[in-house]
């Protein structure tokens, strides 16, 4: 079970520093954006991160939505990352979800962030590059340290 | 203005019961998580429950598990905390809060605290 | 839960910098940023100095900061004022069955 807690609005980066956003196709891609790029593509950059309270000790228990005509909510369903048309619930009744992420500090890097499914035990949101684009998958953690799967997030609220 | 208002505190004699309630005022109360929090005279602070956004989660210290039960009516504003089976070591001010959790904005508000006497 | 440990008393003279700590664990202070400090001074309800480990609302002085290292939280105050007497309080989310701990508080006295 999960209980919204409240939610805030962030910008999240990946360690080389690019900004994650929505392109127009709705895919969550990164890129080297300046603050004032990030201010000029926002709401498309500004994403809702809802907090929830998980019924089992496994930790604080998140979603993350973006606002653009309306509000989109990231899923993992069969491992493929993607936006869904929808609302974070403020219940949910069951412990796995595709649209929760357990969001934890990295030991010894506290201001780093890891959001590791709820559906998919050890897997991980990473960015990874796919040709010249910078994309936000699902991954299965495969070494300690893997930068790709730790991420900082910025308060812009 | 944001404003928290306890109401329904008093005396009451051990095994008895209470009702505490909360009305808030100038901000999105169903957009927050709530708590009730305790002092007991000349001591720390406890928190005592929490409860989610829609109320579906309720969450309580060891010490009141099984006895306080926490609920929300977002339609009006409110807050409550029920409270059974009262012991003298329940006695103390019980203020209601919205503790900051994350976030630039969150907040911080706390009501002015009811006094809950337990004693025969 | 248990809760955080604080010592129960520190002191110190106008114009010094003193340290309160406020020990956890993984499950609370060690796994999440979401750690705060409270300032009560007797008969007032708690106000907010520091959230998430480090930042400060507006309105607060800067001569408040906190920071964090494994399972332990810490407060700092420089410039110690007649004013900032009071006790303190470190709270943290806990993944526990529970919501919010706090600590067990730290009476400052400005000496």
């Known amino acids: 079970y999960f209980g919204k807690l409240e939610s805030k609005l962030s910008v999240i980066r990946n360690l080389n520093d690019q900004v994650l956003f929505i392109d127009q196709g709705n895919r969550p891609l990164f890129e080297d954006m300046t603050d004032s790029d990030c201010r000029d593509n926002a709401p498309r950059t500004i994403f809702i991160i809802s907090m929830y309270k998980d019924s089992q000790p496994r930790g604080m228990a998140v979603t993350i939505s973006v606002k653009c005509e309306k509000i989109s909510t990231l899923s993992c369903e069969n491992k493929i990352i993607s936006f869904k048309e929808m609302n974070p619930p403020d219940n949910i009744k069951d412990t796995k979800s595709d649209i929760i992420f357990f969001q934890r500090s990295v030991p010894g890097h506290d201001n780093k962030m890891q959001f590791e499914s709820s559906s998919y035990e050890g897997y991980f949101l990473a960015c990874e590059k796919e040709r010249d684009l910078f994309k936000l998958i699902l991954k299965k953690e495969d070494e300690l340290g893997d930068r790709s799967i730790m991420f900082t997030v910025q308060n812009e609220d | 203005e944001v404003q928290l208002v306890e109401s329904g505190g008093g005396l009451v004699q051990p095994g008895g019961s209470m009702r505490l309630s909360c009305t808030a005022s100038g901000f999105t109360f169903d957009e927050y998580a709530m708590s009730w929090v305790r002092q007991a005279p000349g001591k720390g602070l406890e928190w005592v429950s929490g409860i989610s956004t829609g109320g579906g989660g309720t969450y309580y210290a060891d010490s009141v598990e099984g006895r306080f039960t926490i609920s929300r009516d977002n339609s009006k504003n409110t807050l409550y905390l029920q409270m059974n089976s009262l012991r003298a070591e329940d006695t103390a001010v019980y203020y209601c809060a919205k503790p900051w959790l994350s976030g630039s904005r969150s907040g911080d508000f706390w009501g002015q605290g009811t006094l809950v006497t337990v004693s025969s | 839960q248990s809760a955080l440990t604080q010592p129960a008393s520190v002191s110190g003279s106008p114009g010094q910098s003193i340290t309160i700590s406020c020990t956890g664990t993984?499950?609370?202070?060690?796994?999440?940023?979401?750690v705060s400090w409270y300032q009560q001074h007797p008969g007032k309800a708690p106000k907010l100095l520091i959230y998430?480990?480090?930042h400060r609302p507006s309105g607060v002085s800067d001569r408040f900061s906190g920071s964090k290292s494994g399972n332990t939280a810490s407060l700092t105050i420089s410039g110690l004022q007649a004013e900032d007497e009071a006790d303190y309080y470190c709270s943290s989310f806990t993944s526990s069955s529970s919501l919010y701990v706090f600590g067990t508080g730290t009476k400052l006295t400005v000496l």
């Open positions: 998430e480990v480090s």
């Open positions: 993984s499950s609370d202070v060690g796994g999440y940023n979401y």
